[in-house]
């Protein structure tokens, strides 16, 4: 129900890394925020990664997560790594204000991430 903004399109780097900003308009003074990245394909939604952070502190994903991020005010800079061409799709930023009450939830319109697998290097003859 909160407004959440994210870019419409992002092109992953040749190393399979994509970064985008997720910005939310907070109705209140949240101290604990949860950010989740969802991937939507047709009617299927899967969780890519999630992190909870205290306002003013760093965003920490689990060690084995493919995501990293930093936060600044109501803005979260998200990076997804290890992407392959088959991971091309719509990535949705979900923001939840967990504490204190009231609970608020916002869903972005999604960022279409395009991933192009790098061409294998041709053999060189010297």
């Amino acid at each position: 129900a909160m407004h959440v903004a994210q870019p419409a399109v992002v092109l992953a780097s040749s190393r399979g890394i994509a970064s985008f900003v997720c910005e939310y308009a907070s109705p209140g003074k949240a101290t604990e925020v949860r950010v989740t990245v969802l991937r939507q394909a047709d009617s299927q939604v899967t969780e890519v990664c999630a992190a909870t952070y205290m306002m003013g502190n760093e965003l920490t994903f689990l060690d084995d997560s493919i995501c990293t991020g930093t936060s600044s005010g109501n803005q979260v800079n998200l990076t997804i790594q290890g992407l392959r061409a088959m991971d091309t799709g719509l990535y949705i930023c979900k923001v939840e204000l967990m504490y204190p009450p009231p609970y608020y939830l916002g869903i972005g319109n999604g960022t279409q991430i395009y991933v192009i697998d790098p061409e294998p290097c041709p053999d060189s003859d010297f």
């Epitope: 129900a1 907070s26 109705p27 003074k29 009450p101 009231p102 869903i107």
Partner: antibody, heavy 115, light 108 residues
Amino acid sequence: EVQLVESGGGLVQPGRSLRLSCTASGFTFSDNWMNWVRQAPGKGLEWVGQIRNKPYNYETYYSDSVKGRFTISRDDSKSIAYLQMNSLKTEDTAVYYCTGGMDYWGQGTTVTVSS
Amino acid sequence: DIQMTQSPSSLSASVGDRVTITCGASEIIYGALNWYQQKPGKVPKLLIYGATNLADGVPSRFSGSGSGTDFTLTISSLQPEDVATYYCQKILSPPPWTFGGGTKVEIK
């Protein structure tokens, strides 16, 4: 302690108006989107409408069943939300609850629309 | 508007039973779902918010799961004080924040 107290309910004739008030205490009223929810006798819960707060320009939203007849407003300085009900119909008979976010609920006030 | 369909509309179970109530949305709602408990003659009370988060003071026998369009409220071991009607509600913008039709839970 969080408290939401609704008032203004009663018996009213079809076509007439009524204004409900919801007085809040024990939490930061201005941080909350205020909702009105109603429950007709023996029926389920029905979301009536919502007023958001200042960061959201006090946007209001209504269910189709009350759109154009009901108006929600708020006074953050007094921590009060209002539900102005015009052109009342018999099917508006219900217990009306106000809620802060959807976390906090008042005890409800009964509105009976009958001739 | 997104429709919320709850099932069953009523159920009767024994004390200690595991009870499951489902709520389906007509479109993807990304976990934007609350569950409420309303005991007879009482005010509704928030049980679960954001599909999976237990509200303050709610016993741990209650849990919520699901994402996308299909959601579940589970009572792991039904207690006499759990006799109530349970409602799901979509909390995704834009409103309306529609409620499901309710599930009445009784003890056998």
